[in-house]
């Protein structure tokens, strides 16, 4: 008949498993339960994947690995005797009197329950990495954490190379024994110990469970250190940078930590496993029964086969590791799980020209001298698209791309952003908002949804803010509906008249030139250069100002560049910015200063794109450490990451305007990085490329 082979990871667990198997057999529970001995949870997962075992109970981190690497699925979950059901919450606690937030943890003193423990280490460290707050180079998480905090107590870190920093706050027992031990000898060990570390002022933040503060304050704790503590003197750090009362853990936490769950192969019937265990718990989970499923006392251990605190086992409806873990915990695990042994020794950068090869070579040498990991190798390609092909084919690893190329890299080649560029506010030509400007006119006000039949002013055919984005957006929103991919005709029929300067006017609809005025002599009408007075962003705005058009599609800076005395030309000298408004996608109008909230799209900063299986945190970790040394254009370290003047080129490897590389944070896909509006505009235009 059918049998289920449970995988045990130790002799005591094998002993308990044997007793459970025997108890189930005597009770006539089917299918029969057998026990297989593995050497560790990891080994058991491999045995299950290899069909040499069938089931094991795992914690969240192991469920993530088992699901991601071996395709196992969770089918039965543990429920603990507490109100939060199949999970608990990892929180960061601070003293109410402090000014610490999640964004200012760098340099503060930290208290952890223990090395590699879920709420004390895995979740907070994973979250800080995944959110971009903590950069890790070369998978050396311990070094990154020891550099990040201003001293810590991480019980169990004494054996590591960074014990000076990671054990600095630990104190051992009353006689000074067991300092930094992962055991009760260290007074700051475990949930209550980490909280004590905070309460006694050794640390500034404690990473504990949602219930820890309430269990150790307001007279609920027996030890003298906690008797006078009040829960109201502590607060939780929220992910959005705010703080909350310690009772608000459902809303304010680092992650919901999933309960342990039984995992099996994808082809195993989860219902069968639950029915087996459910029969078992019905008979063997209460006091006095011959076998105790949820107790390990008889074996001199804790948490054998199941956690001792389990009150019941429940079936898991959505049997995927992602659904069980939840996005918060999943994200934290992504940030944490970085295996130095599986980290490629090189990051192969795609280069497109001789000057770029030279700069990349210098970058590789400079990084190597500073022992930055992984090392850079430079690989040539013919074009951005060729880079994408080579990255997809695993011949190259990374390349910096512009918005349109990011779209292609993501959509066609499946690449994802690993890091982005950030420019100073003065560098608006590198990343800007596309806006629709109108005159402030209370009597004839119209919205973005009412543009049909209006007169439009565009910088020029094919200009991003003047044509591609606004026309793409209007197509995507269904206002402009090209027939047979004839965008020009569709636009000419949508607007009453327009000025869209163009270089090659062959077969160009006349209404797209109807508002153009040419030069002072009336010649060169609608030409795609400055001889046409309504050419370019300044010209498109002038077209609006002089009442030729009703709406101008320009950059967010255009109105400011030509009002309030910023342009002394006669047509602009007396203009005031407050006489103009923006049309917003939601149908509203807004002040021109509200461009960040009211725009058709943002032309995004460039981003470093990689394959989805590349660890983006190691890429950013490398770039972040590198920019500390080489990011400042005036650095004395022998290489300038964001300057190309030594190579007789521009924007080599990175845009010269970059002031720093930034983590992608939550923008982990090409769509996330580009923004929905920009993607919609590109899709609107690309839908017409027949």
């Amino acid at each position: 008949g059918m049998e289920v082979r449970w995988c045990a990871t130790s002799d005591p667990e094998q002993h308990k498993c044997g007793n459970m198997s025997e108890a189930f057999r005597e009770a006539g529970i089917q299918p029969s339960l057998l026990c297989v001995r593995g050497t560790s949870a990891d080994h058991c997962v491999q045995l299950i994947a290899a069909q040499e075992a069938d089931a094991i109970t795992l914690d969240g981190g192991a469920i993530y690995e088992a699901g991601k690497e071996h395709g196992l699925k969770p089918v039965v979950g543990e429920v603990y005797d507490q109100e939060v059901g199949t999970s608990y919450y990892a929180v960061a606690v601070v003293r109410r009197s402090s000014h610490v937030t999640i964004d200012t943890l760098k340099g503060v003193k930290s208290c952890h329950t223990g090395i590699n423990r879920t709420v004390g280490w895995n979740v907070p460290v994973g979250y800080l990495v995944e959110s971009g707050r903590l950069s890790v180079m070369g998978c050396d998480v311990l070094k990154a954490v020891s550099d990040y905090f201003g001293g810590s107590c991480v019980p169990g870190a004494g054996e590591t190379s960074y014990s000076e920093s990671l054990c600095r706050l630990c104190r051992g027992d009353s006689s000074g024994e067991g300092v930094c031990d992962k055991s009760p000898l260290e007074r700051y060990y475990d949930y209550s110990g980490a909280f004590r570390c905070l309460a006694e002022g050794a640390g500034d933040v404690a990473f504990v469970k949602h219930s820890t503060v309430l269990e150790n304050t307001d007279g609920k704790t027996l030890p003298s250190w906690g008797q006078a503590l009040l829960s109201q003197d502590f607060e939780l750090l929220c992910r959005d940078g705010s703080r909350a009362d310690v009772t608000e853990w459902r809303q304010c936490h680092l992650a919901r930590v999933p309960a342990h769950a039984v995992v099996v192969r994808a082809d195993t019937d989860g219902g069968l496993i639950f029915r087996l265990l459910n029969e078992g718990q019905r008979l063997f989970s209460h006091e006095g029964s011959s076998f105790q499923m949820f107790s390990s006392e008889a074996y001199g251990q804790k948490d054998l086969l199941f956690k001792d605190s389990t009150s019941e086992l429940v079936p898991i409806a959505t049997q995927t590791y992602e659904a069980w873990l939840g996005h918060e915990y999943l994200h934290a695990m992504k940030g944490l799980l970085c295996d130095p042994n599986r980290l490629p020794p090189y990051l192969r950068w795609c280069v497109l020209s001789t000057p770029e090869i030279q700069k990349c070579g210098d970058m590789a040498v400079a990084f190597r001298r500073q022992r930055l990991k992984p090392e850079i190798q430079c690989v040539s390609a013919k074009s951005p698209q060729h880079c994408m092909e080579r990255i997809q084919a695993e011949q190259v690893d990374a390349v910096t791309l512009s918005g349109e190329d990011i779209y292609t890299a993501g959509k066609t080649y499946g690449l994802v952003p690993a890091a982005g560029e950030h420019y100073a506010p003065e560098d608006s030509s590198n990343s800007y908002y596309v806006v629709a400007v109108v005159r402030r006119d209370s009597s004839h006000a119209f919205t973005l949804d009412e543009l049909r039949g209006k007169r439009s002013c565009h910088a020029g055919f094919g200009s991003p803010a003047g044509w591609d984005v606004p026309v793409g957006a209007l197509i995507q929103r269904g206002f402009i509906r090209p027939k047979d991919c004839d965008v020009l005709t569709a636009v000419s029929e949508f607007f009453n008249a327009s000025c869209v300067p163009v270089n090659n006017p062959k077969n160009y609809p006349s209404s797209l030139c109807a508002l153009c005025v040419g030069d002072e002599q009336g010649r060169n009408k609608c030409v795609g250069n400055s001889q046409e007075r309504y050419y370019g962003y300044r010209g498109a705005f002038r077209c609006l100002v002089e009442n030729a058009g009703d709406v101008a599609f320009v950059r967010h800076t255009t109105v400011f560049d030509n009002t309030n005395g910023h342009n002394s030309e006669p047509w602009a000298a007396e203009l005031r910015s407050e006489d103009y408004e923006l049309l917003c996608p939601n149908g509203a109008r807004a002040e021109v200063s509200q461009f960040a909230a009211c725009n058709l799209a943002q032309i995004p900063p460039h981003a470093v794109m990689v394959r989805p299986d590349t660890n983006i945190f190691t890429v950013y970790g490398l770039l972040d450490k590198a920019q500390d040394l080489f990011g400042d254009d005036h650095n004395k370290n022998g290489f300038k990451m964001f300057d190309s003047s030594n190579y007789h080129g521009q924007d080599l490897l990175f845009k010269d305007a970059t002031v720093r590389a930034v983590p992608v944070g939550e923008k982990t896909t090409y769509r996330g990085w580009l923004g929905l509006d920009y993607v919609a505009a590109l899709e609107g235009m690309s839908s017409q490329q027949c």
């Epitope: 100073a424 003065e426 560098d427 030509s429 800076t557 400011f560 200063s593 960040a596 254009d633 930034v662």
Partner: antibody, heavy 119, light 112 residues
Amino acid sequence: QVQLQESGPGLVKPSETLSLTCTVSGDSITSGYWNWIRQPPGKGLEYIGYISDSGITYYNPSLKSRVTISRDTSKNQYSLKLSSVTAADTAVYYCARRTLATYYAMDYWGQGTLVTVSS
Amino acid sequence: DFVMTQSPLSLPVTLGQPASISCRASQSLVQSDGNTYLQWYQQRPGQSPRLLIYRVSNRFSGVPDRFSGSGSGTDFTLKISRVEAEDVGVYYCSQSTQVPPTFGQGTKLEIK
């Protein structure tokens, strides 16, 4: 009318962390760039860094290893932390706004708060 | 960093007379977008700095028209057409064409 107000301890011990908060009224810190500048007694102005409308930070390379600027949008506040301070960090600390309307000049400043580093 | 050098460092002026302060940048302040990000600030005794001029020559709102700015590239000038008693203080030029923004050493204007 845009107003900025710095707050925080006026005395910090050497090697400790200086923490200041800037409370903004009359504008939202989710638009524009929000800056910290300092001025040692009797000396000139030194730029410390900014936090952008989207929460991205930039720090003057001369101070980068010791500076953190963060924000709390719910309170319309942003903060400065400067770690491992020495007597050379004694200065009046100003918060200031930069927006496109004045081409990212610092158009509104707080009144400044004097921070003395001394044991 | 871009170095901003002001002259003179001290400027005694008679009330009602004009005053001129010069500022020189170590490199051109013309940005790729064509704008020149050069500002002038006034700091009266015991007060915080106050924006006077931005983008070389644009007066900030509320600034009297006796203040004017001019210049291009690396050389810039702040002029006060007729000095008044309330103009006493230190004047700083500043650039933000390249990060980090930098300031001149300041010019102290006093009444003779």
